[in-house]
C-alpha cells in the first residue's frame, strides 16, 4: 500500500457509510469504494501527477528550504459520482443516479 | 503564520527565481509572490475550504481511524497568472503576460 | 452463475400494454440495480431507466417517462417492465441489464433481450 | 443529451488484423466510457469501462483509449468471434446514451 514513503498514487478506500453516521440517510449501498490519495510528492514531479506551475515551483522551493517550505500534497485532481439510494427531506427513498464528488478519479500533486 | 496546527489558510511564500534555478530563462521579475496553503483540515470542514464530497467523507473516516486514513490536505485549489519576461528557444526576450497556474488564488481541503 | 431471463417475443396490437420479465439468477437481487434498453431495428441502444429491485424506486429517462413502468418482485428476483399506449415505435428488442455496481456505471450482465411487435 | 457518434457503420476486417473502432461524444464526457459488444444472436457484453478498464474475462486484445471527446476500441489481433457490433455509451450525464454501433465484418 501507498505510504508516506511511495509516490503519490490511488490506493483504495472502503467507506462504510454507518462507520462515518451516513446510514442515517443512506440506504443504499451500505459501503462504496471511496478511494485516497497516498504517497509523497517527490522531485522530480512525474507527469502522471500532473502538476502545476505552482506545484513545481513550491517542489522546487521545498528542496533549498526544506523546513520553511512543505511539499506539494498528493490529492485527487479528479472526482466521480457513485448512486445512492437516500431519503430525501420527507424520508421518501429516492434514488440520486449520480451523486458527484465521491469516488477518485484521479490522484497528483499540488 | 499558520502551521499545522492552525487551520487551512493561504500564506506568504516569496519566491526567488534563481533559488530555483529558473534564473536562467526568466529576466523578469527577480522574485514573485506565489503564496502556498498551510494548515490542517480538521472536522468540521468550514465553508472557506471549499470540500469536496470526498474530502468530507475521507475527514469522517479520519476520524473514526486516524491511524488508518489519513485528513484531506490543505492544497491550491484556484490558481493566479504572473506576467513573466523570459528568454524563447532563440534567447530572445519575450513578454507572456499571462503565465498562469504560479500564483495561488484560493486553498481549499481536498 | 449471474443470468438474466427474459420472457418471450410478444406481438401485440397498438394502443395496448405489454409487460416484459427479467428473472435473475446466480446473485443477490436486491443489491444490484435493474436497468432497461430499447433497440429498434437496426438501431443503436438507448437508455429507458433504472430501478432497485429491493424498494422499487426508478430513475427514468425523460423519453420513456409515461411509457415505461419498472417494477421489481423480491420473492422471485425478478424486474418487469411494463410498456403502455403501444405503437409502431415501440416495436424494438428490450434488454434488462444488471449495474455492476453502485460506484461502477457499467452493465456485466445482460438479459438476452425480448423482441416486441407492435402491429394491428 | 449528449450524443454519441460512431462515424463507421461498418467495418471489413481480416482475421489477424489490428481493428480500431472510433467513437466521438458531442461534449468533454471526461473518460465516462463503456464499450459493449453485441454478437449476431444479439447476446451483449461488457468489454471495457472507465475508457480502458478491461471486464474481468476480456481477452486482452481488447484495449481502449481516448479522452475529452474522442475514444476508441481497438482489437489487436482479430478473432472469428469478434465479428459483432460495437457500441460506445457514456455515463457522465443523464440519460446514458449509446452510440449507433459499428458493425464488424469478414473480408
Known amino acids: 500500500s501507498a505510504g508516506a514513503g511511495s509516490h503519490c498514487q490511488k490506493t483504495s478506500l472502503r467507506v462504510n457509510f454507518e462507520d462515518i453516521g451516513w446510514d442515517s440517510w443512506i440506504i443504499a449501498p451500505k459501503e462504496y469504494e471511496a478511494y485516497e490519495c497516498k504517497g509523497g510528492c517527490f522531485f522530480p514531479l512525474a507527469d502522471d501527477v500532473t502538476p502545476t506551475k505552482h506545484a513545481i515551483v513550491q517542489t522546487l522551493v521545498h528542496l533549498k528550504f526544506p523546513t520553511k517550505v512543505g511539499k506539494a500534497c498528493c490529492v485527487p485532481t479528479k472526482l466521480s459520482p457513485i448512486s445512492v439510494l437516500y431519503k430525501d427531506d420527507m424520508g421518501v427513498p429516492t434514488l440520486k443516479y449520480h451523486y458527484e464528488g465521491m469516488s477518485v478519479a484521479e490522484c497528483g500533486c499540488r | 503564520s499558520a502551521g499545522a496546527g492552525s487551520h487551512c489558510q493561504k500564506t506568504s511564500l516569496r519566491v526567488n527565481f534563481e533559488d530555483i534555478g529558473w534564473d536562467s530563462w526568466i529576466i523578469a521579475p527577480k522574485e514573485y509572490e506565489a503564496y502556498e496553503c498551510k494548515g490542517g483540515c480538521f472536522f468540521p470542514l468550514a465553508d472557506d475550504v471549499t470540500p469536496t464530497k470526498h474530502a468530507i467523507v475521507q475527514t469522517l473516516v479520519h476520524l473514526k481511524f486516524p491511524t488508518k486514513v489519513g485528513k484531506a490536505c490543505c492544497v491550491p485549489t484556484k490558481l493566479s497568472p504572473i506576467s513573466v519576461l523570459y528568454k524563447d528557444d532563440m534567447g530572445v526576450p519575450t513578454l507572456k503576460y499571462h503565465y498562469e497556474g504560479m500564483s495561488v488564488a484560493e486553498c481549499g481541503c481536498r | 452463475q449471474v443470468q438474466l431471463q427474459q420472457s418471450g417475443a410478444e406481438l401485440v396490437r397498438p394502443g395496448t400494454s405489454v409487460k416484459v420479465s427479467c428473472k435473475a439468477s446466480?446473485?443477490?437481487?436486491?443489491?444490484?440495480?435493474m436497468e432497461w434498453i430499447k433497440q429498434r431495428p437496426g438501431q443503436g441502444l438507448e437508455w429507458i431507466g433504472v430501478?432497485?429491485?429491493?424498494?422499487?424506486?426508478?430513475n427514468y429517462n425523460e423519453k420513456f417517462k409515461g411509457k415505461a413502468t419498472l417494477t421489481a418482485d423480491i420473492s422471485s428476483s425478478t424486474a418487469y417492465m411494463q410498456l403502455s399506449s403501444l405503437t409502431s415505435e415501440d416495436s424494438a428488442v428490450y434488454f434488462c441489464?444488471?449495474?455492476?455496481?453502485?460506484?461502477?456505471?457499467?452493465?456485466?450482465?445482460w438479459g438476452q433481450g425480448t423482441t416486441l411487435t407492435v402491429s394491428s | 443529451d449528449i450524443q454519441m457518434t460512431q462515424i463507421t457503420s461498418s467495418l471489413s476486417a481480416s482475421l489477424g488484423d489490428r481493428v480500431t473502432i472510433s467513437c466521438s461524444a458531442s461534449?468533454?464526457?471526461?473518460?465516462?466510457l463503456n464499450w459493449y459488444q453485441q454478437k449476431p444472436d444479439g447476446t451483449v457484453k461488457l468489454l471495457i469501462y472507465?475508457?480502458?478498464s478491461l471486464h474481468s474475462e476480456v481477452p486482452s486484445r481488447f484495449s481502449g483509449s481516448g479522452s475529452g471527446t474522442d475514444y476508441s476500441l481497438t482489437i489487436s489481433n482479430l478473432e472469428p468471434e469478434d465479428i459483432a457490433t460495437y457500441y460506445c455509451?457514456?455515463?457522465?450525464?443523464?440519460?446514458?446514451?449509446f452510440g449507433a454501433g459499428t458493425k464488424l465484418e469478414l473480408k
Open positions: 441489464a444488471r449495474r455492476a455496481n453502485w460506484d461502477l456505471y457499467y452493465f456485466d450482465y
Open positions: 446466480g446473485y443477490a437481487f436486491t443489491n444490484y440495480l
Open positions: 430501478i432497485h429491485p429491493g424498494i422499487g424506486v426508478t
Open positions: 461534449q468533454d464526457i471526461s473518460n465516462y
Open positions: 472507465y475508457t480502458s
Open positions: 455509451q457514456q455515463y457522465i450525464n443523464l440519460p446514458l446514451t
